[in-house]
Interface confidence: low
Amino acid sequence: NAKGNYCKRTPLYIDFKEIGWDSWIIAPPGYEAYECRGVCNYPLAEHLTPTKHAIIQALVHLKNSQKASKACCVPTKLEPISILYLDKGVVTYKFKYEGMAVSECGCR
Amino acid sequence: NAKGNYCKRTPLYIDFKEIGWDSWIIAPPGYEAYECRGVCNYPLAEHLTPTKHAIIQALVHLKNSQKASKACCVPTKLEPISILYLDKGVVTYKFKYEGMAVSECGCR
């Protein structure tokens, strides 16, 4: 159903070894990053905090899908994680490594 | 070519009549809203100001397209336009109607 496929936050566990970041990130071995998945169909729900441009684009797409692409479901709020990492060969504790995990998704 | 299909700002003219907004927007009849089109493939170009999360998501997608969707090409900076509109039957001038036109695109 369309509602089930609507823009929302879904789990995405990142294993640093898998992406080759274990060479400099010591801990944690991975983290829950989440991702934003789903469609942004008109009318755009309020909780997806659409910009005016996104509303207009979704509306144009609804009327003529050739003219404009759909608005896109993307992270609108990101949170930090704390990591231990190597900096010039020295282990460093990064208290807040910003922009790593999705806390909110929206239509843009 | 992949570079030509990369995330960038493309023209999108909005005709207020087409989307039914001419009922309250008196002028202009339309405006250049632009839209963001194209792919966000790893490695993400610096001018697309990717977040760390977008970089990681693009990298995971590159390694396993089933595990994560691509990062998405969306407006990262919007600009206002000036409009004349009807407010309770009174023609009103709005000097800055925010968030209407794309000035920059990026990968999120």
Partner: antibody
Framework: QVQLKETGPDLVQPTQTLDITCTVS????????VHWVRQPPGKGLEWMGT???????DYNSAFKSRLAISRDTSKSEVFLKMDSLQTDDTAKYFC?????????WGQGIMVTVSS | QFVLIQSDSMSTSAGSTVKLSCKRS????????VYWYQQHEGRSPTTMIY?????PDGVPDRFSGSIDSSSNSAFLTINDVQIEDEAVYFC??????????FGGGTKLTVL
């Protein structure tokens, strides 16, 4: 299961050297980091230093050059060595495991500095 | 280098809510995470809150962490206080260069 156990002397003479061993089990010292923290009687916690899993060491500058932390990964042991002890070094000395946060502590060893 | 200031002691009654504070003397409380430890008399500390507001497994959800930038303080809130919550609570944060800074601790008495 994860365990940390501090062993060493109960009593040290002023100006002498303190040697404490933290023996760990249930995890590898090349995966997790180990803190040394002390607590004088009736007082708060004081971080002394950390043995990082990669072999690097960080010290609290308050201990200047008096403190040395080392390890023997094959024996799963981390060592604390502190010189020139004074009576105000009387404290309970803890080792603790740091992963994403400090999740396990040893029971601590009470060391009295007195003649 | 900053210090973390905690009140020496607090009293509360069982079943009530208590909010322990941890004020950073200089610099922004939000610039690095705050951790909270509980220590019962004669025991080793245990982590109650990490990364400012996250609870390790096994820590009751009666315990929560928060920060308030206007007072430059971190808080540990304990709802529905139990007798077994009587302990000393330490906050901890970081100064630059991976220095682990502890507050002086607050002794919580449950009446």
């Amino acid at each position: 299961q994860v365990q940390l156990k501090e062993t060493g002397p109960d009593l040290v003479q002023p100006t002498q050297t303190l040697d404490i061993t933290c023996t760990v089990s249930g995890f590898s010292l090349t995966t997790y980091n180990v803190h040394w923290v002390r607590q004088p009687p009736g007082k708060g916690l004081e971080w002394m230093g950390t043995m990082w899993n990669g072999g690097g060491i960080d010290y609290n500058s308050a201990f200047k050059s008096r403190l040395a932390i080392s390890r023997d990964t094959s024996k799963s042991e981390v060592f604390l060595k502190m010189d020139s002890l004074q009576t105000d070094d009387t404290a309970k000395y803890f080792c603790a495991r740091l992963g994403y946060y400090v999740d396990y502590w040893g029971q601590g060893i009470m060391v009295t500095v007195s003649s | 280098q900053f210090v973390l200031i905690q009140s020496d002691s607090m009293s509360t009654s069982a079943g009530s809510t208590v909010k322990l504070s941890c004020k950073r003397s200089t610099g922004n409380i939000g610039s690095s995470y705050v951790y909270w430890y509980q220590q019962h008399e004669g025991r080793s500390p245990t982590t109650m809150i990490y990364d400012g507001d996250k609870r390790p497994d096994g820590v009751p959800d009666r315990f929560s962490g928060s920060i308030d930038s206007s007072s430059n303080s971190a808080f540990l809130t304990i709802n529905d206080v139990q007798i077994e919550d009587e302990a000393v609570y330490f906050c901890q944060s970081f100064s630059s260069g991976i220095k682990f800074i502890f507050g002086g601790g607050t002794k919580l008495t449950v009446l």
